[in-house]
Amino acid sequence: SAHAHPRDSCPLGPGRCCHLETVQATLEDLGWSDWVLSPRQLQLSMCVGECPHLYRSANTHAQIKARLHGLQPDKVPAPCCVPSSYTPVVLMHRTDSGVSLQTYDDLVARGCHCA
Amino acid sequence: SAHAHPRDSCPLGPGRCCHLETVQATLEDLGWSDWVLSPRQLQLSMCVGECPHLYRSANTHAQIKARLHGLQPDKVPAPCCVPSSYTPVVLMHRTDSGVSLQTYDDLVARGCHCA
């Protein structure tokens, strides 16, 4: 394989490394209150935390990036914590004919990795 | 649609926002010199730069993240610049039976976005 095994234990201490965290947001926060009806409050899972060397590497590219960041930190950024997958959610919104239920596939993160 | 159109012009000035940049790396840099034979030097495209509000948003989640980062910067990180696609590369490496050519699909970035 082109890379070492990604590391899953956080060397920085509990809760410091890339993980999923729930953030509550209202439709007003999102600027959606004019077209989304319900729910007015969303539980949004987001990816937060640091990506130390080889922690939850998304792929070979991320492993390389981590290594080159160690060698050239000014030139190559460290990997960062982004969604690896999403959980679909349903929103109710206004339509010309009334109210509709619609699925959004890329709104709430389900898992995170370092890319 | 659940989000405003992602912005493609960089408000921070030329070269400051998320873009593809080529980094030269040797097999020694990557720690691969013991098993990869050729090429000895790789042109690695990587994603670098900042992700100001709505710049090259990967999806709805990234748009939300940008907005919530503006409201709660201590709790929600800004989107960051990661690969949106990859270019396959071929490496020649040692095997038990000699030498083999192998394609790696996730080694070199081809495009970038803010996730």
Partner: antibody
């Protein structure tokens, strides 16, 4: 805890109207919509409609269109369902239920209100 | 409207049995399916949402699976308190619709 408390049982004559209330507590009333679902004796569940507690937008089942009106009073966190021109086949237990939420869940139900239509 | 067809309409089982109830949608509903348990004289109780997510406080012997048009509720080891009627419900689009129900009875 989150709960929906409905008004008491009603007995009505054919042609009359009934108004059932549903008082919400334990959550922000305007963050969700309220569904009304009914169940005739010995039968399954029938969705009657939905109202957005924040805006008052509604979506009614086709077969009840024109006879049903759903409203909310945000000052008291109460939803109402009025059904007019009652018939004997409207005899049922009427439930209010919160949702759908972001995962299409209708998660909290009222205890039900028995409405009997009889001459 | 999306029709929800549940089967069987009733099932006789013993404590400890594994019970499987199926629900079929007349058109694709992604994973927007919920399962409810209802006991006589009581309101329905949410067991499973989004086809496979267990509602908080519901025992892990209940599980849901499926997506698109075919869905399953499984009770891995039937307990005395599980004898009830079970309903599936779609919330992919209005009007929200329910299956006809499956009564789980004591054998």
């Amino acid at each position: 805890q989150v709960q929906l408390v409905q008004s008491g049982a009603e007995v009505k004559k054919p042609g009359a109207s009934v108004k059932v209330s549903c008082k919400a507590s334990g959550y922000t009333f305007t963050s969700y919509g309220i569904n009304w679902v009914r169940q005739a004796p010995g039968q399954g569940l029938e969705w009657m409609g939905w109202i957005d507690a924040y805006s008052g937008s509604t979506n009614y089942a086709q077969k009840l269109q024109g006879r049903v009106t759903m409203t909310t009073d945000t000052s008291t966190s109460t939803a109402y369902m009025e059904l007019r021109s009652l018939r004997s086949d409207d005899t049922a237990v009427y439930y209010c239920a919160r949702g759908p939420g972001q995962y299409a869940d209708v998660d909290v139900w009222g205890q039900g209100t028995m409405v009997t239509v009889s001459s | 409207d999306i029709q929800m067809t549940q089967s069987p309409s009733s099932v006789s089982a013993s404590v400890g049995d594994r019970v499987t109830i199926t629900c079929r949608a007349s058109q694709g509903i992604s994973s927007w399916l919920a399962w409810y348990q209802q006991k006589p004289g009581k309101a329905p109780k949410l067991l499973i949402y989004a086809a496979s997510s267990l509602q908080s406080g519901v025992p892990s012997r209940f599980s849901g699976s499926g997506s698109g048009t075919d869905f399953t509720l499984t009770i891995s080891s039937l307990q005395p308190e599980d004898f009830a009627t079970y309903y599936c419900q779609q919330a992919n689009s209005f009007p929200i619709t329910f299956g006809g129900g499956t009564k789980v009875e004591i054998k």
